[in-house]
């Protein structure tokens, strides 16, 4: 049976999963998949680790703890109703049928408040950037002050550059994401 976790549209969802490494650095592969855990592996893999690193991930899915310490909890960024469903965390312990399997049911609720559409001129003023830090559990949000003004064109450019830039990789590695708004 699956255990239920909840998140709101637009928020980050947190799906906890842990194991105790047999010894420091003695990691076991872990996979996260959409859908209940099958007999072997994970179906519809969204993230995978091996004995050394995260070797596969898809956008919006990341590990917000330190997987080298056995914290393989999954964060799904900026969830939509389509993210609802069962997720499988599978700790792939060596040996036949030794895997630990956790089926986690994610229930996405509509956002409580839908903000009114923002007019373009609202973006041209200075605005806070929100940094969602690497965390254990629901994202912690803090406002970063004293940042320069930035206009709509720059936002668009920045967003495009972030997608493939080293900064995006650094942020992903540290478990951080920048939300602009």
């Amino acid at each position: 049976s699956e255990v239920e976790y909840r998140a709101e549209v637009g928020q980050n969802a947190y799906l906890p999963c842990f194991y105790t490494p047999a010894a420091p650095g003695n990691l076991v592969p872990v996979c996260w998949g959409k859908g209940a855990c099958p007999v072997f592996e994970c179906g519809n893999v969204v993230l995978r680790t091996d004995e050394r690193d995260v070797n596969y991930w898809t956008s919006r899915y990341w590990l917000n703890g330190d997987f080298r310490k056995g914290d393989v909890s999954l964060t799904i960024e900026n969830v939509t109703l389509a993210d609802s469903g069962i997720y499988c965390c599978r700790i792939q312990i060596p040996g036949i049928m030794n895997d630990e399997k956790f089926n986690l049911k994610l229930v996405i609720k509509p956002a409580k408040v839908t903000p009114a559409p923002t007019r373009q001129r609202d973006f041209t003023a200075a605005f806070p950037r929100m940094l969602t830090t690497r965390g254990h559990g629901p994202a912690e949000t803090q406002t970063l002050g004293s940042l320069p003004d930035i206009n709509l064109t720059q936002i668009s450019t920045l967003a495009n550059e972030l997608r493939d830039s080293r900064l995006a990789n650094d942020l992903r590695d540290s478990g951080a994401t920048i939300r602009i708004g």
Epitope: P16, F18, T20, G65, K69, R134
Partner: antibody
């Protein structure tokens, strides 16, 4: 053998600050989350916060934000807990602990902090 | 924060009795629950992790069960050395939280 050796008892005046240490042996603190837990006399256990010594990332319980600062010196394999603005309410035994990764498998012997004028 | 409510807060029992201590989480914590024993004047000691896994060296008379929000620590036959205070702890979300403790005494 895994051991967590904490610094000795402290008697400090209200308003002062104190820094407690927890020297680890038998393992590398970079491989674990290191935590601090408080226990007042005849009371239960309260989680203060933790550090990931590998990158210095910290988490705190809301009630200890601004009161506690957790750091770690990986060169000496030692996590620290600094407490500021001390009051008599902070009089307690402070434990360091190692988590693996979500439960505490080893604890220090505790440091008794007494805040009194 | 996730609240951990432990019951009873104190318990008086006879040697050989079967003891159960309950821990209720204010929200789902799956199986990410641990139990600790603290004898008077001593440090806490891990008994059970992942709700039901016995830590190395812990006598088999101790067992843990439960998941999601309801958990139980059982001592199958109370021994004199079991006199202590017992705590549950959730490690799923920060801040980690402990139950208020159950003080176990001999009748």
């Amino acid at each position: 053998e895994v051991q967590l050796q904490q610094s000795g008892a402290e008697l400090v005046k209200p308003g002062a600050s104190v820094k407690l240490s927890c020297t680890a042996s038998g393992f590398n603190i970079k491989d674990y989350y290191m935590h601090w837990v408080r226990q007042r006399t005849e009371q239960g256990l309260e989680w203060i916060g933790r550090i990931d010594p590998e990158d210095g990332e910290t988490k705190y319980a809301p009630k200890f934000q601004g009161k506690a600062t957790i750091t770690a010196a990986t060169s000496s394999n030692t996590p620290y807990l600094q407490l500021s603005g001390l009051t008599s309410e902070d009089t307690a035994v402070y434990y360091c602990g190692r988590s693996n990764p979500y439960y505490f498998d080893y604890w220090g012997q505790g440091t008794t902090l007494t805040v009194s004028s | 924060d996730i609240q951990m409510n432990q019951s009873p807060s104190s318990l008086s029992a006879s040697l050989g009795d079967r003891i159960t201590i309950n821990c209720h989480a204010s929200q789902n914590i799956n199986v990410w629950l641990s139990w600790y024993q603290q004898k008077p004047g001593n440090i806490p000691k891990l008994l059970i992790y992942k709700a039901s896994n016995l830590h190395t060296g812990v006598p088999s008379r101790f067992s843990g069960s439960g998941s999601v929000t309801v958990f139980t620590l059982t001592i199958s036959s109370l021994q004199p050395e079991d006199i202590a205070t017992y705590y549950c702890q959730q490690g799923q979300n920060y801040p980690y939280t402990f139950g208020g403790g159950t003080k176990l005494e001999i009748k």
